[in-house]
Amino acid sequence: MKVLQEPTCVSDYMSISTCEWKMNGPTNCSTELRLLYQLVFLLSEAHTCIPENNGGAGCVCHLLMDDVVSADNYTLDLWAGQQLLWKGSFKPSEHVKPRAPGNLTVHTNVSDTLLLTWSNPYPPDNYLYNHLTYAVNIWSENDPADFRIYNVTYLEPSLRIAASTLKSGISYRARVRAWAQCYNTTWSEWSPSTKWHNSYREPFEQH
């Protein structure tokens, strides 16, 4: 049994890091493998993560840890029984993938403006809380070409757009994701999408 692709890990910069790797053949990750992780700090104890399958030869492990600070560094040991398959380290602050925003809501009752709001996925005492920017994806269920991205570079988790920028009388979906420039993070996963029927009053034509 050998590791084909070494574990790569990302942290939510809160309390969960996710590590993924590939073995050289089909593997029952949860029964055959263990990922031990330990904060490099006096008196910290090692923890065991039981991986789950992620495709035939792929494994994924969710590491639970105390709230991350930028200096944290973890040792990682991947074991198959008594055999050490791989040894490495992971600094959560250097590999951040933010949590996905939540509670995306489309408010359609503000004259002819669409107001999209969502929740910041971090509590106010987390460093990322004031450093997230967002991308909002809106697309038509009827027309795959009607697909647009709005970059929200201010801190407020909301976006206003004129309903008339979208086609009237059809259904749209929206989703949102986040990233933080300060830690050069990757993008978060997309939030669950929300659906609404777009309709607005056409302005009278002037003759």
């Epitope: 969960i16 923890h47 993560c49 639970l64």
Partner: antibody
């Protein structure tokens, strides 16, 4: 598929010792944490203690003076002893496996065994 | 000991309703929070660990969120088989459970 089975007397007299064993089938006791949990009739869940396969233990502070949990890796079993029982110890007793270290939830449970403390 | 307070203690909701149960810890527990479902006469079943990670095999209508002291279990669309008692449990220190929330179908 890992299965857990609790066994032991269903009736214990006050002031005596309650003894239960959890037998693990379909998997190994190694590399996991194992807990005992109890649930008095119509009430919530109370964690009693856990043991690592190497023998390290941690007990509920409110029960610590009366509890011993031990492990027998050769039999794939771990056991609970609770001394000086009273009627308040009447409950369904469950054994369970943590899905990794103790910081993870308990993903495999026995079906539970009812223990009544009565003279 | 860390006290876990669940609310409400019981609720009644209609099929396909969105149901939310909250759990509050008496001190910060990071994301060391697990949710269980228990049906009458059965052992508890792990739904979510690490506050938000869905246990393998659990339907995606269950989700968890929160960190620190305040946590939420959400059932996005209540199904008949969701009639049960739900418990939260912290694993930051010696494990303790919330008092449970009984979910009934209207």
């Amino acid at each position: 598929q890992v299965q857990l089975q609790e066994s032991g007397p269903g009736l214990v007299k006050p002031s005596e010792t309650l003894s239960l064993t959890c037998t693990i089938s379909g998997g190994s006791i190694s590399t996991y944490y194992w807990s005992w949990i109890r649930q008095p009739p119509g009430k919530g869940l109370e964690w009693i203690g856990y043991i690592y396969y190497s023998g390290n233990t941690n007990y509920n502070p409110s029960l610590k003076s009366r509890v011993t949990i031990s492990v027998d890796t050769s039999k794939n079993q771990f056991s609970l002893k609770l001394n000086s029982v009273t009627a308040a110890d009447t409950a369904v007793y469950y054994c369970a496996r943590h899905r990794g270290s103790y910081v993870y939830g308990m993903d495999v449970w026995g079906q539970g065994t009812t223990v009544t403390v009565s003279s | 000991d860390i006290q876990m307070t669940q609310s409400p203690s019981s609720l009644s909701a209609s099929l396909v309703d969105r149901v939310t149960i909250t759990c509050r810890a008496s001190q910060t527990i990071s994301s060391y929070l697990n949710w269980y479902q228990q049906k009458p006469g059965k052992a508890p079943k792990l739904l979510i660990y690490g506050a938000s990670i869905l246990q393998s095999g659990v339907p995606s209508r269950f989700s968890g969120s929160g960190s620190g002291t305040d946590f939420t279990l959400t059932i996005s669309s209540l199904q008949p088989e969701d009639h049960a008692v739900y418990f939260c449990q912290q694993s930051y220190s010696s494990p303790t459970f919330g008092g449970g929330t009984k979910v009934e179908i209207k």
